[in-house]
Interface confidence: low
């Protein structure tokens, strides 16, 4: 009652290996690493057969089939390429994930190489079975920002793509009687978050309570160059409007806010985020040069009072920008203390501009980012937000523009963007 000699399957083995197999002897068929036993269209690790009384084996020897990891999962904001010929997805095949450059980069700077493991899963040395994450690249416009700027008073037209983080925020507060409409600027921090000044998003009430405008009343435009032609721009409604809880309407202390967009915006040459600074109380050093852009008043012959009294909020049609030096806190404080009126320059603010005037931000530029190039990281960083100015006309002599010191709020910003209250989990490159 001997059973016939067994031939092990290709890429497999039989245990125990005996010269003779008799009735009731059992053998276990297993496959080499990266192969699985294939029997009746079912895949298993091992398969047992037995020598029967009539000298026949209970089953045929199964085959060993190479493990197949299948088509790799798609990567959000990335792509996958096959390193192995014929786009093989079997054991020891390699694939490489990469992010959509130059707009996204890989978190943790992993190689992005995944190998088909013996377990049938695509595996990376560092991330194991987890997919890599493609994060937005911040503060690196596709067009290099210029070094020199002549004299959004004393500014010049920006070319499309120079300030890809620049957002136009339009607020139409239908809860007011009569309806109130105004605008400001903001800066894109990620696909879903806009940084701006709190006063841009405060409901224009007749008292001093700070109530944010309803999200339904906010529209954000990105990739916009000329306000007369919004066809190429991305417009988005707001999912959330978050004012800094300590924003003070009397002195504009803590003048900072966030808008979470209803839908993430696609990044590209004309829509890219700005970087946040490191959290440090010092803020930008005096004499450092920064750039600020906006669609605010650019006509030095029109006074702010005229604009306010006429009820219109005059825009520059084309995005303007200006280069301004940071002014020491002491000098700025002194310049405002010498004026009549209660002008408080707090530690949450810094000033920029020229003693002789001529270049400045103005009404309508509010909330726009004052950006400084960080030599160490080679990124542009939002160090300030256009906040307020003195009683005189924009660009007046010895009246500096006052900016929210963003570095004081980095922790608050990250908390809000990653809090359980956020509409969805978002990661942003710092």
């Amino acid at each position: 009652n001997e059973c016939p000699k067994l031939q092990p399957p290709v890429y497999g083995k039989i245990e125990p290996s005996q010269a003779v197999y008799s009735f009731k002897d059992q053998v276990l068929v297993s496959c080499d690493t990266g192969y699985k036993v294939l029997k009746d269209n079912g895949v298993m690790d091992t398969f047992q057969i037995e020598c029967l009384k009539d000298g026949a084996w209970s089953n045929k020897i199964p085959t060993c089939k190479i493990v197949d990891c299948g088509a790799p999962a798609g990567l959000k904001h990335g792509l996958v390429t096959f390193s192995t010929r014929n786009n093989l997805t079997t054991y020891k095949s390699e694939i490489r994930y990469s992010c959509q450059q130059p707009y996204y980069k890989m978190l943790h700077n992993t190689t992005g190489v995944y190998t088909c493991s013996a377990h049938g899963t695509w595996t990376n040395e560092v991330l194991k079975r987890s997919l890599p994450t493609c994060l937005p690249v911040c503060g690196q416009p596709s067009r290099a920002l210029p070094n020199l700027v002549k004299r959004i008073i004393g500014g010049r037209n920006a070319e499309l793509g120079l300030f890809p983080w620049q957002a136009l925020i339009v607020v139409e507060d239908t809860s007011r009687v009569p309806n109130d409409k105004w605008f400001g600027s903001g800066a894109l921090l990620s696909e879903s978050w806009i940084l701006t000044a709190a006063h841009v998003l405060r409901s224009q009430r007749r008292d001093n309570t700070v109530i944010p405008v309803s999200k339904e009343h906010v529209t954000v435009y990105l990739g916009l160059h000329d306000v007369r032609d919004k066809s190429g721009a991305v417009n988005s409604s707001a999912a959330r409007v978050i004012l800094h809880p300590d924003f003070n309407i009397q002195n504009y202390n803590h003048d900072i806010a966030l808008v979470q967009l209803q839908k993430p915006v696609p990044l590209g040459a004309h829509v890219m985020p700005i970087c946040l600074p490191r959290p440090e109380p010092e803020g930008p050093a005096p004499h450092m040069l920064g750039l600020v852009a906006g669609w605010g008043i650019s006509n030095p012959n029109v006074t702010v009072d005229e604009i306010i009294l006429s009820g219109t909020r005059t825009l520059s049609d084309v995005l303007q920008y200006v280069k301004l030096p940071v002014v020491s806190h002491a000098e700025c404080k002194a310049s405002y203390e010498s004026r009549s009126g209660n002008y408080s320059v707090t530690e949450n603010m810094f000033c920029a501009g020229y003693y002789e005037g001529g270049k400045d931000t103005c009404l309508g530029d509010s909330g726009g980012a004052f950006v400084i190039f960080d030599e160490m990281s080679q990124h542009w960083v939002a160090q300030g937000l256009v906040s307020w100015g003195g009683p005189e006309e924009c660009g007046s002599k010895q009246v500096y523009g006052v900016y929210t010191k963003v570095s004081n709020y980095v922790d608050w910003l990250w908390e809000e963007m990653n809090s359980p209250r956020a509409v969805r989990d978002l990661q942003v490159e710092r």
Epitope: I211, S214, R240, D411, W414, E415, N418, R421, R430
Partner: antibody, heavy 114, light 112 residues
């Protein structure tokens, strides 16, 4: 000053539903979410969920997804919690809290008994 | 879901003694971006509503006596009462707010 005033005790039959209320005063109701917490007699605290009055957005503890429904009425500055298909396991004190748990209601006792 | 484990479940100390209770989370509560631990401590006296004592693991809520100190980071946290007073008789709960909210089982503090 900030106050959260909750509705009075409830004695309900198994299988029935009950609606608890939490009336806020002393702050702008729409600026912060309202949390609801359960505490069975002699037991610990269990987070049920929260609601953001400004846009009615809610988040629930998975355990309470089919048990509780959170709503608000901004005209009366009141948050509500509906509890459905009550069993003896739902007998507990239910608290509401706001302004990041700085302020709490006094609690509402719900007793489920036939 | 994040699981919060408190120990001991109860302890009895004399007035004036120092007491420490611990809270462990099943995953880190430290947000590396904000550099904050999303853990809070609450005190619940008999028949009362809970009261917030500490947030961000170590920041004392305004009006809370300075004998209450929170410490720890990542997954291991503790609440210390430097000199227990009779009015500290209560159950103390930790709560994570890193991902939604979960309370620990509580530590009952009794005064000898």
């Amino acid at each position: 000053q900030v106050q959260l005033k909750q509705s009075g005790p409830e004695l309900v039959k198994p299988g029935a539903s009950v609606k608890l209320s939490c009336k806020a005063s002393g702050y702008t109701f729409t600026t912060d979410d309202i949390n609801w917490v359960k505490q069975r007699p002699g037991q610990g605290l269990e987070w049920i969920g929260w609601i953001y009055p400004r846009d009615d957005r809610t988040k629930y503890n998975d355990k309470f997804k089919d048990k509780a429904t959170l709503t608000v009425d901004t005209s009366s500055n009141t948050a509500y919690m509906d509890l459905h298909s009550l069993t003896s396991e739902d007998s507990a004190v239910y608290f509401c809290s706001s302004l990041e748990d700085t302020y709490w209601g006094q609690g509402t006792l719900v007793a489920v008994s036939s | 879901d994040i699981v919060m484990t408190q120990s001991p479940s109860s302890l009895a100390v004399s007035a004036g003694e120092k007491v420490t209770m611990t809270c462990k989370s099943s995953q880190s509560l430290l947000n590396s971006r904000t550099r904050k631990n999303y853990l809070a401590w609450y005190q619940q006296k008999p028949g009362q509503s809970p009261k917030l004592l500490i947030y961000w693991a170590s920041t004392r809520e305004s009006g809370v006596p300075d004998r209450f100190t929170g410490s720890g980071s990542g997954t291991d946290f503790s609440l210390t009462i430097s000199s227990v007073q009779a009015e500290d008789l209560a159950v103390y709960y930790c709560k994570q707010s890193y991902n939604l909210y979960t309370f620990g089982g509580g530590t009952k503090l009794e005064i000898k």
